[in-house]
């Protein structure tokens, strides 16, 4: 019973985690313009892995994709790769874990096969979670480095009369979603690995002993006793809460001359 619950919970937690990793990867707010103290500009810039966006105080929002591949920073490419690898591994892990679930009967699948599949999906979830955490952390490190560099250069002119105030970027909502999602996927993977141990059939060290009677031959083979957990679902009402923070952006439409949002 405990094994089924652990496996089921591991699957659900991983599912939430992978959904979060996908959401984070698609989100535009990986880095957002630093508004500490005052909104210096009447324009708000934010960037994702795939495009950068600008929201004017008029409500007009414009996003532009990064249409170059070679012109992008190597770090950004690395983050993209880590997130995609995380999603792919997580998706495969989910697929494998569905068939590995003890509460789902597929033909005459051995418990040992289910145990192996549970372990495989668990490892995949762990690696997926680590990829997401690594990707988000690399991006965060890049932001911190750039933040302090731009702070140092913030009020320095370009040698002439014209000053350029550099836009500083800070952590966007996607980073927090990614960290939480990666953590959940990792926890889900660990739970799957723990469940695998309970699923594996217990090996016995007893050798088969033959007792010979005088009249007729009877072989008695003592076998190991295995407790059955059954296939029933856990009847306890367990509420699973998604710990991920949901950010609500102002949904702004295009301002027309007669209706500027």
């Amino acid at each position: 019973m405990a094994v089924t619950a652990c496996q089921g919970l591991g699957f659900v937690v991983s599912l939430i985690g992978i959904a979060g990793i996908i959401a984070a990867t698609c989100m535009d707010q990986w880095s957002t313009q630093d508004l500490y103290n005052n909104p210096v500009t009447a324009v708000f810039n934010y960037q994702g892995l795939w495009r950068s966006c600008v929201r004017e105080s008029s409500g007009f929002t414009e996003c532009r994709g990064y249409f170059t591949l070679l012109g992008l920073p190597a770090m950004l490419q690395a983050v993209r790769a880590l997130m995609i690898v995380g999603i792919v591994l997580g998706a495969i892990g989910l697929l494998v874990s569905i068939f590995a679930l003890k509460c789902i009967r597929i033909g005459s699948m051995e418990d040992s096969a289910k145990a192996n599949m549970t372990l495989t999906s668990g490892i995949m979830f762990i690696v997926s979670g680590l990829c997401a955490i690594a990707g988000v952390s690399v991006f965060a490190n890049m932001l911190v480095t750039n933040f302090w560099m731009s702070t140092a250069n913030m009020y320095t002119g370009m040698g002439g009369m014209v000053q350029t105030v550099q836009t500083r970027y800070t952590f966007g909502a996607a980073l927090f979603v990614g960290w939480v999602a990666g953590g959940l996927t990792l926890i889900g993977g660990v739970m799957m690995c723990i469940a695998c141990r309970g699923l594996a059939p217990e090996e016995t060290n007893y050798k088969a002993v033959s007792y010979h009677a005088s009249g007729h031959s009877v072989a008695y083979k003592p076998g190991g006793f295995k407790a059955s957990t059954g296939f029933g679902s856990n009847t306890k009402n367990k509420k699973i809460y998604d710990g991920g923070a949901r950010t609500e952006d102002e949904v702004q439409s295009y301002p027309s001359k007669h209706d500027y949002v």
């Epitope: 909104p39 009447a42 004017e56 105080s57 414009e62 350029t164 836009t167 500027y260």
Partner: antibody, heavy 117, light 113 residues
Framework: QVQLVQSGAEVVKPGASVKLSCKAS???????VHWVIQAPGQGLEWIGE????????NYNEKFKKRVTLTLDRSTSTVYMELSSLRSEDTAVYFC???????????WGQGTLVTVSS | DIVMTQSPDSLAVSLGERATINCKSS????????????LTWYQQKPGQPPKLLIY???TRESGVPDRFSGSGSGTDFTLTISSLQAEDVAVYHC?????????FGGGTKLEIK
């Protein structure tokens, strides 16, 4: 048709306060409304802005201590109160609605405030 | 604060001739995120509020005659009236719509020679 209708001319004594209104009609009252001052024969100067959605406001540091922007969503009206008036505050005050590029596409007709003893 | 410097202060041009007004900002008004310049041009006639002509430094507002055009990037901007008409006599203002506080140029008075 989009319209920003401002209150009538005011004559006030130095040291007093004045509260000007700007009523919006013909569009959804949800975006920043700005206030601009124009002294006689002078250029334009930005005072501040208020967002009718959340009542958040930004002010020009020069006017921050003396200006308060408020709004009444029920009547789609924005108010600007200017306190501690002095003779140099004699000017035409405009309200304006924001548009693409943060530009001001719609303007009120202006309110002339005369500060005189 | 961003200083917007307009030149000349006044300009007299013959009807049908080209009129050019310049505006220089103390800081770049180019937003790297969308490659747009947050500079606006207004026309103001006596006793009237300003009228929007051009935003994003070069985008003409609907209903504005195509003889009006805006150009420039970063810190240097130009408003050009290709063929001056009698109704174009007014004061022209440029505005920084990027940095707070939003600031205006001193204005250029355009007259007919």
């Amino acid at each position: 048709q989009v319209q920003l209708v401002q209150s009538g001319a005011e004559v006030v004594k130095p040291g007093a306060s004045v509260k000007l209104s700007c009523k919006a009609s013909g569009y959804t009252f949800t975006n920043w409304v700005h206030w601009v001052i124009q002294a006689p024969g002078q250029g334009l100067e930005w005072i501040g802005e208020i967002n009718p959605t959340n009542a958040r406001s930004n002010y020009n540091e020069k006017f921050k201590k003396r200006v308060t922007l408020t709004l009444d969503r029920s009547t789609s009206t924005v108010y600007m109160e200017l306190s501690s008036l002095r003779s140099e505050d004699t000017a035409v005050y405009f309200c304006a609605g924001i548009y693409y590029g943060n530009s001001f596409a719609h303007w009120g007709q202006g309110t002339l405030v005369t500060v005189s003893s | 604060d961003i200083v917007m410097t307009q030149s000349p202060d006044s300009l007299a041009v013959s009807l049908g001739e080209r009129a050019t007004i310049n505006c220089k900002s103390s800081q770049s008004l180019l937003n790297a995120g969308n490659q747009k310049n947050y500079l606006t041009w207004y026309q103001q006639k006596p006793g009237q509020p300003p009228k929007l002509l051009i935003y994003w430094s070069s985008t003409r507002e609907s209903g504005v005659p195509d003889r009006f055009s805006g150009s420039g990037s970063g810190t240097d901007f130009t408003l050009t009236i290709s063929s001056l008409q009698a109704e174009d006599v007014a004061v022209y203002h440029c505005q920084n719509n990027y940095y707070y506080p939003l600031t205006f140029g001193g204005g250029t008075k355009l007259e007919i020679k």
